[in-house]
Amino acid sequence: TGADTEAVVCVGTACYTAHSGKLSAAEAQNHCNQNGGNLATVKSKEEAQHVQRVLAQLLRREAALTARMSKFWIGLQREKGKCLDPSLPLKGFSWVGGGEDTPYSNWHKELRNSCISKRCVSLLLDLSQPLLPSRLPKWSEGPCGSPGSPGSNIEGFVCKFSFKGMCRPLALGGPGQVTYTTPFQTTSSSLEAVPFASAANVACGEGDKDETQSHYFLCKEKAPDVFDWGSSGPLCVSPKYGCNFNNGGCHQDCFEGGDGSFLCGCRPGFRLLDDLVTCASRNPCSSSPCRGGATCVLGPHGKNYTCRCPQGYQLDSSQLDCVDVDECQDSPCAQECVNTPGGFRCECWVGYEPGGPGEGACQDVDECALGRSPCAQGCTNTDGSFHCSCEEGYVLAGEDGTQCQDVDECVGPGGPLCDSLCFNTQGSFHCGCLPGWVLAPNGVSCTMGPVSLGPPSGPPDEEDKGEKEGSTVPRAATASPTRGPEGTPKATPTTSRPSLSSDAPITSAPLKMLAPSGSPGVWREPSIHHATAASGPQEPAGGDSSVATQNNDGTDGQK
């Protein structure tokens, strides 16, 4: 078959077998199927631990696996044409033996998004690390392989065989050897539980052929859900050893007679079963059948029991174990619900805080409230967020869009706004003229003045600084003062030669702080528009409109 059974673990109502062999997923499934099983399911953390145990057993016996990262097929597959579904725990994969989707998964990494190819899952084992119950094998998905080409690092597979029930291992009261043969053709001398329909061959004696006795038993269903071997009394008993060998094969107490014979007995609260070896509790709760925090509750007349879970938990399909109830499925919260063991908690999205009517309600955080505004200038609260805006002559700046920075209108994207010299100020700008020119009433153009070789007319005195001045008219010359360390204009403007023919020299003499002669308060020329920044609103230039790059819509503040 290309695969050898190297290990077997039986627990509950299932047996897991691990096999080494470089087979494709289909060949591995076929191998399991021939013996009445399927590639193994891993539907819970507990089942993952059983599978890990059988793999550990295999690896102890396996001399040298070829890859450090070894993969073993399990029964999780996605058929050709079935797409990856990120919304499901099994991502659109399903168990080959059928059965419902379960919430447990242990994916190794983000899955490859595909639909065309059939995809198969293997358990990924790092053989350089010890196998620990806390470090369960991860699920790795990939192509399913083909005969002779199983896929990278495939070293074997795990099968699962399910049974109606299990028998306890046979107990020997003296020297001997038990060999179990399971329905799935595995032979073993050490099983924690032996599956229904298994045969047990018991050879008593210490190897001396003359003294060897053989017994043959079958694990049968004696009554509904009661499985035993049909043997009575301990096997291979020997007067030579009495109770000293393996406690006489007794489950609890062993009582010796004077002639070397012995009997099995039970402790108070227990009774001896028909096999005359095993003890069972008179009180069904005394064996602690309930797990995971479940409480055992006796039924009428102390005959049977039920398990009961604490609040926030419910019984799983075995009716023995408690699993957390996912209260979040009922959407009890206004925004985010976090399921917790035995309960849940409500959380609010960024930009919201707990509050408002009803349990788990959330209300908007007013980031613009007094004393908490993150914005340098204007702040507008929005539902779940906020955005900042800036006053005229400033634009939003800073990585998070909360700061305001002066717009240098003198170097705006539409070119200089002044006919000749341009002086940027905090939040505004003003125009000036070269020597021999005077500022026109519109505060932008320069007209030929009385011949003078004095300094250029410059920025206004402090008290004259006010609203932005200027409108778009044909430009003759541009000048932009170089910037001081704090973004304020230096005294010396940079100038470019006027395009109008002029003999007036270009000066670099210190400026006198002169107001533009006859400058008006605000000039608007609605018919002429200044080109604003891309996607910004189109406003007439000059006046109190945003002339250069300002877009007062603001940007959303980042939380």
Epitope: K80, G81, C83, L84, D85, P86, S87, R112, N113, S114, C115, I116, S117, K118, P143
Partner: antibody, heavy 120, light 108 residues
């Protein structure tokens, strides 16, 4: 960014075959399936089939079965679609497309299209 | 195969008006597997809405999608000049993937 660049327009005779290429860039070629869709004025958009570049597995529309072959060359990140026994009904714009990081066959990326004209 | 039928074939709408495009499947389709594409003349189709109601990257919020089972709808709340184009629905519930015949949205 993801780019799909297709080979140029083709003029072929009835009964002949055509092989169109689609060169992918901006992602790992074997990560995403490649699909082929054609568009005609009569039939509109028709899915021809797809290939999984990792395995070479294909899925074809039954309407084209036996006439279409999809292949790939992972070394040059290129997918190919060959259509044989052409008739005038196969005159169409042929697109290669894939769904990138989206799920459920939502075709996020498209080639520029290759016009195939079947005429004698 | 599942046949996708779009109606109307042509929709004449004025800019600023609301437009509703319908897509009907011949048998039930999972809402996760129902998508819409926009195509302008001479260009390749472009994914517009995926999984019934999710807008593809960069698609304006005036577009929305809804539906389940066999009936799906694409709605444009206020048509802009750039929205005039052909829209196709597409489904997958096993091969082959199929597209609707398209609805051409034109200026009234």
């Amino acid at each position: 960014q993801v780019q799909l660049v297709q080979s140029g327009a083709e003029m072929v005779k009835p009964g002949a075959s055509v092989k169109i290429s689609c060169k992918a860039s901006g992602y790992t070629f074997t990560d995403y399936e490649m699909h082929w869709v054609r568009q005609t004025p009569v039939y509109g958009l028709e899915w021809i089939g797809g290939i999984d570049p990792e395995t070479g597995d294909t899925a074809y529309n039954q309407n084209f079965k036996g006439r279409v072959t999809m292949t790939r060359d992972t070394s040059i990140s290129t997918a190919y679609m060959e259509l044989s026994r052409l008739t005038s009904d196969d005159t169409a714009v042929y697109y290669c497309t894939n769904y990138g990081n989206l799920y459920y066959y939502a075709m996020d990326y498209w080639g520029q299209g290759t016009l195939v004209t079947v005429s004698s | 195969e599942i046949v996708m039928t779009q109606s109307p074939a042509t929709l004449s709408v004025s800019p600023g008006e609301r437009a509703t495009l319908s897509c009907r499947a011949s048998s039930s389709v999972s809402s996760s597997y129902l998508h819409w594409y926009q195509q302008k003349s001479g260009a390749s189709p472009r994914l517009w809405i995926y999984s019934t109601s999710n807008l593809a990257f960069g698609i304006p919020a005036r577009f929305s999608g809804s539906g389940s089972g066999t009936e799906y709808t694409l709605t444009i709340s206020s048509l802009q000049s750039e929205d005039f184009a052909a829209y196709y629905c597409q489904q997958y519930s096993g091969y082959p993937l199929t597209f609707g015949g398209g609805t051409k949205v034109e200026i009234k």
